[in-house]
Each structure stands twice: as C-alpha cells, then as structure tokens.
Amino acid sequence: ASVGLPSVSLDLPRLSIQKDILTIKANTTLQITCRGQRDLDWLWPNNQSGSEQRVEVTECSDGLFCKTLTIPKVIGNDTGAYKCFYRETDLASVIYVYVQDYRSPFIASVSDQHGVVYITENKNKTVVIPCLGSISNLNVSLCARYPEKRFVPDGNRISWDSKKGFTIPSYMISYAGMVFCEAKINDESYQSIMYIVVVVGYRIYDVVLSPSHGIELSVGEKLVLNCTARTELNVGIDFNWEYPSSKHQHKKLVNRDLKTQSGSEMKKFLSTLTIDGVTRSDQGLYTCAASSGLMTKKNSTFVRVHEKPFVAFGSGMESLVEATVGERVRIPAKYLGYPPPEIKWYKNGIPLESNHTIKAGHVLTIMEVSERDTGNYTVILTNPISKEKQSHVVSLVVYVPPQIGEKSLISPVDSYQYGTTQTLTCTVYAIPPPHHIHWYWQLEEECANEPSQAVSVTNPYPCEEWRSVEDFQGGNKIEVNKNQFALIEGKNKTVSTLVIQAANVSALYKCEAVNKVGRGERVISFHVTRGPEITLQPDMQPTEQESVSLWCTADRSTFENLTWYKLGPQPLPIHVGELPTPVCKNLDTLWKLNATMFSNSTNDILIMELKNASLQDQGDYVCLAQDRKTKKRHCVVRQLTVLERVAPTITGNLENQTTSIGESIEVSCTASGNPPPQIMWFKDNETLVEDSGIVLKDGNRNLTIRRVRKEDEGLYTCQACSVLGCAKVEAFFIIEGAQEKTNLE
C-alpha cells in the first residue's frame, strides 16, 4: 500500500512483500526489505520506531537506499502496520501484518494492564474500544460491568474491526465502570485488557460576558472582561479570545474553574481578560469562545475607548413636552458621555427629590401629571471625573380637558316656576381654553322615564335627541350670551350663559365644551312647574347652628298630599354624558322628612324646620305634591347650602397716621366671618361714642373724625366680634399743631 502523493521525481519505496496484508504464525521470523531512491526509515507497531531490542533494521548489502526489517520469533503483539518512508516526507509504503497467536488474540498495550475509554452520553456518538486483533476474522464481543452485560456485533452500529477495535454507541456503556473485549477460539475464551470507562460531558449551556454591553473606558483605564461558561458535569473547557489589538503588552489572561454548590448539575469555568491601560486601538469587538471539544459557544461585546472623559446632550433631547392631566410623563435625559454623568433635575430652579409622585433619575417620571407640574425643568449633567457640566431646559405644558365647575356645585335637578326668566350657566376651566362651548336641548317628556319603566342610573333617559339651541321650536325661547372670561379661584375660566326668556316647557339643557385634549359636558334638568313653591326662612343661606325652615306652599284646590323629601346621595355618580334622573320618577333616592302642615283659605303650607343646621343638612330638598284630579306628582327641588362657622378676621391693617388739627381722618375696618361679626371702635381702650365730630357708618366699618382736635390723639382699636370670638387691629393717631382758641373765651 502507498501513502502520500507520488512526487514527480520520486517513486514510492518498494517493499519485498507486495501485499497490503500479511498473515504469519507466531514464533516465525518476519523479514521485509524496502528499496527507494533516497534515505529510508521504518516504523512498526507499539514502539513505532527506535530502540525496540527485538526489531532489527539493517542496510542491504546489494544497494544504496535499501533497508531490511527483521523480527525473529514474532508474537501476537507484533501485529500492526509496518511503514517504510522517505525521511522528512509523507511518501511511504505500508503493509499490515497479522501475527496469528491463538493464545493471545488481542494485541496488548505495551505498558498498561488496563486502558481508559472516554465517552460522551450522546445518543448519536459511538466509541471505539481499541482491542485490536492479531487475527483478522475473530468472533469478538464486548463485556461491560457492572452489572454484567455482553454486546455482540449487529452488522449495524455495533462492530469489531481487527485494525481498529470494538465500535459501539457510547450511551450503551455509559453506565459501566469497565469494559473488555472477548474472543472465542475453539471453545476457549480470550480477553483483552480492561478498559476503564470515563464519561466526559461536552454540553456548554451558555457563555456570558461581564460586563455584557455598553463597556466604555477612557484611554489609560483598565479593562477587565470576565467570560463565564456554564457546562454539564465532566467537561473540560478551552477558552479562546479574539480582540482588536492582539499584540498587547499589558494583556493578561487567567482561566480557572469556579466552585459550584454540591449536588449541582452544572460546572462553571471563568476566563478573565485584563488590559491594564487601554489605548484607542483597543476599541472594538471582544469575543470569548469556550470549547469542550464537541461543542463551541461564543459571546461578544463591544468596547468603546474614549480619548478623555466627556459629557453632552444627545440629539433626541426634548425641549417641549406636552401632556394631559392624569397621564404619566416620562422625560428621559438623553446624553452621550463617559463615564455616565450624575443627573440632577430642577423645577423652576428648585432641586427635585424623588417621592411617590415623581421619580427624578435618568428619566424624570411624573406618575400622574397635574396642572401644578407645568413649568420649566432643567436637567444638569455632571461628568464625575472632569466635573464638566451641561444643562438643558425642558418646558412641560400640562393640558386640562374641559371641566365644568357647576357640575359639582349645583343640584342635578332644579325646578323653575312657570313664566319666569332663568339663566343657566356653565363655567369651564380648560387648558388650552375651550375652542367652543355649545348648548343643546331636548324636551323632558320625550326623554324622561315613565314611572312604569325601570330607572337605570347609568342611562336614566331613554333618548338623547339633542337639538341645537338655535332651533328652539316647541321649547323655551333662548338666547346664548357671548362667552365671558373670569378669574375664579385664581384660574382663568370661560363662562357661558344661556338665558331662557320664559320658562314655559320642561326641558333638558346641555352645555358641551371642547378643547384640543378633550371634552366636558353638563346636563341641566330644567323642570318647569306651575305647582308648589318653595321658600326658605330666613331668606338666605344659614350658618351652621342657626335654624332654617323650608316652606312648601301649594294651591289646596289643585294639590294634595304635600310631602318633604331630601334627595339622598346618588346610588352611583353621574358620569360625563349621563343625565340626572327626574326626581319625581325615582322616589328611591329620596328620604322622607318630618314636617308640619298649615293651611290658610287657599293654600296648604308644609314647613320643614332644621334647628341647629349642620353641614350634613346641606343638599337638595324636594317638595312633592299630587294633582287632585290627575294624581300626577309634581316636584320642586331647592338646594340648601349651610355656611360653615368662621371666626372673625379683619382684612387689611389700620395704619398709624399723623394729622394736623382741623383736618379729617377717615379709616375703614373690613371684617369677615360667619356669623357676620359686630364691629366696635375703641379709643385708648374705651368705647368710642359717636358725636358731631365722630361718625360711624356701614355697620361701624367706616370711622370718620371731622375737624380733629388735640384730644382726638390716641390709640384707636377696631374690634370685630361674634359668638366665635373677636379680632382686633390697632393704630395710633398723632395730631399735630396748636389748638386754636375758640370765640367763647
């Protein structure tokens, strides 16, 4: 047999035995001569070349470039390939010699009493147990233990080859501690040496680089990259790194196994790449590859090397952020820089601290934005090394969808006396201001629930055929006033008013306000009644702890069964776009009240008295009367507001003043409180008494001293008192000049 490529000028060495395979008996002599065209050498089994005592290689006597290999008394272990080759070339001729030794059919390893077989538990992998034969056509089986198991060649995946050994799928013997080959010759069993089975893993679960991404350094800094490979047990790992500047002076690689918890089904290997002082040429892709022989996994990361520390804002940094009330606002600080900057946020110059409503970090997050969040936000980036600072201003504009103030203040249902002129109002707050406020209407009887119908709070009216107020055919004559703008509670609001010339028909009116971020609406139930009439005694808003009475007067010839109710809280809130349920058609929400009935010649009067009114008494009071003939119920609603008691306060200060004799002094003392306080004046702690020169007006609010005299000089005190206490302010009046002598002297 020939090995290697034939050279143009060189023939292959020629062997004296022109066969690929030679079979000889043990104890005979093996002799092969090799002839060639230049210096030759022999290789033989086991020792392969060199100093084996029994093997003799001699120069031929009959020519140059000729060598004879002689082995006297050959044994089974001499079985193998005998190779004659030209020195320092691949050109060779090979003959495979079987030395048939029936007492030792397997070729034993020179040094070992046992061998080692490495296997992986891979279904698709086979393993070769190198029990070579000195006889080519033996019947060989493989024994594995423990437990004892025998494997016989099946002509498929299990086979024996005298030159190679026993081939078997590795998983079949992975359980075993040892294996050996066995041959049967003439009912006699012959065993190869024992092979210890060592199961080796190969699976790499993952390869992780740390830091994994966004690695930035500046020139001169140290780069440390950790590459961790997680594998199954019994795996050996080889790490290989690829990086931009391979010829690095200060590069250091350390590989080590990491300890894992006992009982862990996993092994960890770590390779650390360190570059002490990076340069710009170290910028680039760093790849770590971990190999177990059967498997390779790799991971990469990009390392950026900056010339020096720096900080700058990114091009995507916003300058204007618009949001709607209630939204979550995120303003990211977009920057370029190394190392990452310290980030500080300010609002209108005041530092922002994180709390449950706001998070001030790389991203400024306002959980639920409100109007008060409107303003200029400054973000300042500071480079931690160079201390370089960059600032940027972001304006946050918070939009408010239209909110209609009366919704929360005014009763959902009100009754209006027939024939009267009425004004309906919608006060709208919105940012930006509403671009329109439109009024609509519909007849009450078209849309009110019949008593037989079940009232659904979520949809109290079966129809919603809204008509524009310009079309008041069949309704009340209407006029919409031009929108007005008012500063209410410190907010710019738009006020739209609808004037009903004469309340003739019961209807529903709706005002709808729209701006760029939303819409708001308010539905007003305009119930016109010829029926009962409510009056409040005393005819004003009571203060808590005062008494108040509601009088319901109805024509006795038309109405009967007068009853007072209080409108209870709505079972569910009225949502935007929903309509208030007509009170008379839904008595479930009413609480019946005790009241006293009086009569005169024409009317019945039902009086409901609240002694010591409290804030809880506020609400909507309903007087219900039944038509004597039709039995139809008529309702009138009156909203009662109870004012909170407030201790007296005096607004504004009394100023000390200097006045010349004969001039006038005018001062005012404005007091507020509930109940309204009484104002009294004192001079030098004595009650000031009115006379021709001292005038008190407007409930003692204004004090005038005409033609002042020297004796008017002194400490003046204004005191405002109610049952809740007193408030006072003081001023000293200095009178200059000499007193003129009177004519009486």
Partner: nanobody
Framework: QVQLQESGGGSVQAGGSLRLSCVAS????????MGWFRQAPGKEREGVAG????????YYANSVKGRFTISQDNAKNTVYLQMNTLKPEDTAIYYC?????????????????WGQGTQVTVSS
Amino acid sequence: QVQLQESGGGSVQAGGSLRLSCVASGYSVSKNSMGWFRQAPGKEREGVAGINEGGTATYYANSVKGRFTISQDNAKNTVYLQMNTLKPEDTAIYYCAAGSPDPPPLIESVVKYWGQGTQVTVSS
C-alpha cells in the same frame, strides 16, 4: 322694649270654648305677623295658628283647622285665639308669638318675640 302678655287661659270641659288674648306693647300688630304656639307636657312647642301683617291671611295647623280662629284688633294692638270644641289633647301652655312682616310665625325659627304663656286645661 317689646312685651307680649297672654290672658284668657283656664280650665274647661271637653267640647267647651275659650278665647285667648295677647296684648303687644312696643310692637305693632298690624305691621307684623303674629301667631299662637302651644306646648303640651312632655312634648315640643308647636305652631297652632298664624296671621300675616295686615290680617289678610290666616294659617292653621291641621290638628285645629275648623275649630280655632285667629284674629287681630289693630286699634287695641291685640291678637286673639278663639278656641271652640276643645278636646283633652288641646291641654297645653299657649304662647303668643311675634314675627317679621313675613312669613307668619308658625314655627319657632321665625319667632322674634315670645309671651310668657297661659295654661289651658281641657278635661273629659
């Protein structure tokens, strides 16, 4: 100083009559509304009858309607309560009350001035 002085109370058999008078001093009966209240033992004071300024309209509680009549004599600055067909449940102290011109003093919260009261006892 406003003073209201009641008289005419006393004891009477059920079905009998009594006439209560209330003389006002320091207060014009014709320019203000007037009324009568009563308080039975263990009960709250309640409005019985009222008359508006000028005497053009009179008001009665349901319990006395048709039996009691309120009137006034502007010249004497006096208000009267004529009580007919008296019942044992009419037993009470009767008070004269003066209010503003409007509304008539049918409930306590609109009363400005009170009389001392006169006892009426009706036995069955």
